[in-house]
Each structure stands twice: as structure tokens, then as C-alpha cells.
């Protein structure tokens, strides 16, 4: 049986009885389900290590996710030596596949988020990780992504690799502030802690349930949602990314600058766009509560304004502008701004 065919069969659950019959005919669904279960792995090593999908380690070994099997066909020929010089021939094929790039990217993003959380004393929302991973890999063309290094599809499928569809704006919900958190995260130019993601997430925490209710009311389609996501010069950039050292922000060559995480220290937000942090120790008055409520309503607009400010600063640096949002999102934005 051809490799691709074998992979397709695995995906459809033919070689794995644990797949529900309903899902066997739908590759995307099966993969989506598997991915949602297999959350990004880069987290605190001290985190509770109970497998959340109810499998023991031994079971995991024998039933590694189909996605991992599907994507292991990385190479034209199975070699493990540096230049094929290994005295160990290809006697034994590994039955458990190494992870796909998509999974690894998701985990690397999750680990970066974890480090960011540690840095700012925030807590991680594991649901955001699993949602992110499932969104990320679902957006790739599953059958085509299979022959990773088979030389059969060296050309990248641009449509499925669009950064904006891979990193939905909801990913910024990945961090939650701790109950006792009372740091002031107002933006300062060049300040190391001027992290829009942290700002946005502190605000998200304050919003509580309102956001999900608003989202359901708006009923953003995935297309509309992804088209409103910010993407820098076409590169794979999400708001979990933060410049990791000053050299990244002051890169000498434009090409290098474009290939790195953008510097978020530059844009100055207008007072109304800047998410404000009220100290948790303050006793809220009725007036304060109204303000918080108002801020909750404005938070999406604030987020968009933040994105716009960043866009402006990137335009000034001659970085190619991202594609325009679709009209539905623009209208929604205008309505939000009118309300404010």
C-alpha cells in the first residue's frame, strides 16, 4: 500500500478502532478531535502530569495520535545517520512517529506563552492552548502536509499557511491574571514590560464572561475572525511573541528585522485605547463598576485600536501592510467605535 494511502487510512480511523464511526469519513474532523485532546506540551514541568485524555503512558505509546503518525513521513528515505553513514541500517522502522512541524510550532508557542506568564506572574489557560493547537493544525491542508519531506509537495500551500488564519485573535486569551495581580502595565516607550499581550489579557480577565456572550451575539465566522487578525509582513506572528532581546528590536538588516518578532515597545496608545488597570485593593464604587462595564464593552475596540497603532508604526518602517479586513468586520468596528 502506498504511503499516502496508508496515512489517509490512518487519518480516517481505519487502522484505529478508537475513532468514532461518525468521524471516520471526515479527515479534518478526526484530526481536529485528536489535536484538541493532545494539548500543546510546553508547559511547566511541575504542572500536574495526569494525562487529561485518560490514557496511561503505555497506552499512549501504542496509540500515538494519528496526526503524529500521519506527519512522520518526513523524509524521502528513512535514514538516521548524518550522511547515511550509520552502521545501524534501516532494520527497524519506528512505529511511533516523531511530531509534525505544526504540532511543534504549537508547543513552542505554548512554551513561549508559559515563559511570558512566568515573567509577568500570570496564570495559563490550558483551554486556550488546546483551542490554539486544534485551530492551528486544522487550518493546514491535512493530506498535503503529510508528505513533509517526501519531495512531493515542496511548494508551500500559501492559502493554508496564511498567518492570520493560523493565529486567531482569540489566542490572546491564553494568559489570565492571578487574583492578586495588581501591577500597572501601562505602556511606556522602550519599557521592557510594555507588552500588548499582557495588557490585553489583564483586560480580558476583567471582562469575565461578557466577552463570550458578546462573541456569541456577534457570531463571528472563522473567516471574519481570522481576517481581523493582525499579521506582520506575512510572517507567522502572533501576539504571544515578544522581543526576546534588544538586538531583535534593533536589527541592522531589514531582512533580519522582518524575520524577527516585532518590537511592541514603540507605539504610544491614546488614553482611551490604553487598557487601564485598577488596583484590586480598591473598593469599587457604583461609578467604578460602570467604568469597568464600559471598558468591557470597549475592549474589542481597544484591541483593534492597539492593532491599528501597531500597523501605523510598522508602516513607518516600510514593512508591507497586511491585507485589509473584510467589510463585515470593518462595519462591526465602526459600530463599536461609534458606541465609544
Amino acid at each position: 500500500m502506498k504511503r499516502k494511502e496508508r496515512i489517509a487510512r490512518r487519518l480516517e480511523g481505519i487502522e484505529n478502532d478508537t475513532q468514532p464511526i461518525l468521524l471516520q469519513s471526515c479527515t479534518g474532523l478526526v484530526t481536529h478531535r485528536l489535536l484538541e485532546e493532545d494539548t500543546p506540551r510546553y508547559m511547566r514541568a511541575s504542572d500536574p502530569a495526569s494525562p487529561h485524555i485518560g490514557r496511561s503512558n503505555e497506552e499512549e505509546e501504542t496509540s500515538d495520535s494519528s496526526l503524529e503518525k500521519q506527519t512522520r513521513s518526513k523524509y524521502c528515505t528513512e535514514t538516521s545517520g548524518v550522511h547515511g553513514d550509520s552502521p545501524y541500517g534501516s532494520g527497524t522502522m519506528d512505529t511511533h512517529s516523531l511530531e509534525s512541524k505544526a504540532e511543534r510550532i504549537a508547543r513552542y508557542k505554548a512554551e513561549r506563552r508559559r515563559q511570558l506568564a512566568e515573567k509577568y506572574g500570570l496564570t495559563l489557560d490550558p483551554e486556550a492552548d488546546s483551542e490554539y493547537l486544534s485551530r492551528y493544525t486544522k487550518s493546514r491542508k491535512e493530506p498535503d502536509a503529510v508528505e513533509k519531506r517526501g519531495g512531493k509537495s515542496d511548494k508551500q500551500e500559501e492559502s493554508s499557511r496564511d498567518a492570520s488564519s493560523l493565529y486567531p485573535g482569540t489566542e490572546t486569551m491564553g494568559l489570565r491574571t492571578c487574583a492578586g495581580e495588581s501591577k500597572d502595565y501601562a505602556l511606556h516607550v522602550g519599557d521592557g514590560s510594555s507588552d500588548p499581550e499582557v495588557l490585553l489579557n489583564i483586560e480580558n480577565q476583567r471582562r469575565g464572561q461578557e466577552l463570550s456572550a458578546t462573541r456569541q451575539a456577534h457570531d463571528l465566522s472563522p473567516a471574519a475572525e481570522s481576517s481581523s487578525t493582525f499579521s506582520f509582513s506575512g510572517r507567522d506572528s502572533s501576539f504571544t511573541e515578544v522581543p526576546r532581546s534588544p538586538k531583535h528590536a534593533h536589527s541592522s538588516s531589514l531582512q533580519q528585522a522582518a524575520s524577527r518578532s516585532p518590537s511592541f515597545g514603540d507605539p504610544q496608545l491614546s488614553p482611551e485605547a490604553r487598557p487601564r488597570c485598577t488596583s484590586h485593593s480598591e473598593t469599587p464604587t457604583v461609578d467604578d463598576e460602570e467604568k469597568v462595564d464600559e471598558r468591557a464593552k470597549l475592549s474589542v475596540a481597544a484591541k483593534r485600536l492597539l492593532f491599528r497603532e501597531m500597523e501605523k508604526s510598522f508602516d513607518e518602517q516600510n514593512v508591507p501592510k497586511r491585507r485589509s479586513r473584510n467589510t463585515a468586520v470593518e462595519q462591526r468596528l465602526r459600530r463599536l467605535q461609534d458606541r465609544s
Epitope: A45, A49, I105, E111, R161, A258
Partner: antibody, heavy 114, light 112 residues
Framework: EVQLQQSGAELVRPGASVKLSCTAS????????MHWVKQRPEQGLEWIGW????????EYASKFQDKATITADTSSNTAYLQFSSLTSEDTAVYYC???????WGQGTTLTVSS | DIVMTQAAPSIPVTPGQSVSISCRSS???????????LYWFLQRPGQSPQLLIY???NLASGVPDRFSGSGSATAFTLRISRVEAEDVGVYYC?????????FGAGTKLELK
């Protein structure tokens, strides 16, 4: 067959910069991550960082943050490791390896000496 | 950072014998998805490292089944059931769970 071909040995003066290369064949580097690993003489292995050549996204071990810069050129299917302000501590063999550490280059020996 | 410890710097072994190489991590490498992100490599004299075992117990492609990996969340063992001359070299464990990914100091397998 997957191969990672690294550039030849380098002898450089302290304070100088150097750029090591790792050219892949048998696969497209856009389809994977590329890691760089350091091995000092008669010592163990140290992870430097990775790059996603598709978009230039990078991650570094904190100790190499201000020392190393990893880049990639997808048109030539090559990953690069650049060092600045070299010292004798940077004398080592540097390996490039694929995303799951399952294929390694032959290594580049960098000697920093005056 | 996670520290990987390989207590035995070297192990002398007679060809045909079995040998176990151990490795410890300062933190659990067991993720909530059930996978343990511990890798084993062999570096033969004058060569590049080669992946032997990934995710604690999975044999890499082209590696003979004389090699096997096992362990718990923080203690790991690489077992070679019948040592051959070609198995000589330095064995490294590595954690692939948290940044920065880190290697053990290595255990040298030497023939008696």
C-alpha cells in the same frame, strides 16, 4: 536522502564575527525547524536555539540570546548561525539539526584565537 | 532550567553483555498528554550525535531493537541488550519539554 551539509572550519580572532551555514538536501527546510547545538572540546552538548525557516521565527537559550543570531534562506535551503563579539569560550563544534533532532550536520569547528 | 544528570561518566562493558545507562531530570518530563519528552543520542568518536530514542521509549528509525528506553517522569534508562563494538561512544539524554532544551553530560560506553 536527507543531508545537512555544514560549512568548513573557521579560525577567527577574538571580538570578530562569524557566520556558519547549514545547507539541507533531500527536504525543504521550510517544512521543519532547524536547531543549532554547541559542543565544546571534550564536553557535552548545549542547545543554542531554533529557527522556523518558513517565517524566520526564532527562539534562543538565554545564554546565547545576545551572542547568537539564527537566520535562514529558503531559496538556498540554508540555515545560518551568526556569532558576534567572539571569545575563546565560543571555540567549539557547532551542529545544525532538524526539528526533532533526528538528522544532524557533520558539525563546523569554530576556533577563536589571537 | 531543567537539569539533566547522567551519574556515570563512563561504563566499561564486554561485547555481548547487556548494559543500562541512566539519566535523571530535575523536573518531571511527563506532559499531561501522556508523553514523556526525553530523548537519547549516541555520539560515536569523531561523529555527530545520532537520535536513538525519542519520547522516552520510542525507537528512532534505523536503530536496532537491541536499544530500548524506559523510565518514569524523572528517572530514565537506556538499555542495550547485547552490546556490539559499534555501540561504543558517548550517550546523551536530552529533555525536549521546556526551554532551554538541555542535555545530560553524557555517559561514555567503553569496551573492556
Amino acid at each position: 536522502e536527507v543531508q545537512l551539509q555544514q560549512s568548513g572550519a573557521e579560525l577567527v580572532r577574538p571580538g570578530a564575527s562569524v557566520k556558519l551555514s547549514c545547507t539541507a538536501s533531500g527536504f525543504n527546510i521550510k517544512d521543519d525547524h532547524m536547531h543549532w547545538v554547541k559542543q565544546r572540546p571534550e564536553q557535552g552538548l548545549e542547545w543554542i536555539g531554533w529557527i522556523d525557516p518558513e517565517n524566520g521565527d526564532t527562539e534562543y537559550a538565554s545564554k546565547f540570546q545576545d551572542k547568537a543570531t539564527i537566520t535562514a534562506d529558503t531559496s538556498s535551503n540554508t540555515a545560518y548561525l551568526q556569532f558576534s563579539s567572539l571569545t575563546s569560550e565560543d571555540t567549539a563544534v557547532y551542529y545544525c539539526t532538524t526539528g526533532e533532532f533526528d538528522n544532524w550536520g557533520q558539525g563546523t569547528t569554530l576556533t577563536v584565537s589571537s | 532550567d531543567i537539569v539533566m544528570t547522567q551519574a556515570a561518566p563512563s561504563i566499561p562493558v564486554t561485547p555481548g553483555q547487556s548494559v543500562s545507562i541512566s539519566c535523571r531530570s530535575s523536573k518531571s518530563l511527563l506532559h499531561s498528554n501522556g508523553n514523556t519528552y526525553l530523548y537519547w543520542f549516541l555520539q560515536r568518536p569523531g561523529q555527530s550525535p545520532q537520535l536513538l530514542i525519542y519520547r522516552m521509549s520510542n525507537l528512532a528509525s534505523g536503530v536496532p531493537d537491541r536499544f530500548s528506553g524506559s523510565g518514569s517522569a524523572t528517572a530514565f534508562t537506556l538499555r542495550i541488550s547485547r552490546v556490539e563494538a559499534e555501540d561504543v561512544g558517548v550517550y546523551y539524554c536530552m529533555q525536549h519539554l521546556e526551554y532551554p532544551f538541555s542535555f545530560g553530560a553524557g555517559t561514555k560506553l567503553e569496551l573492556k
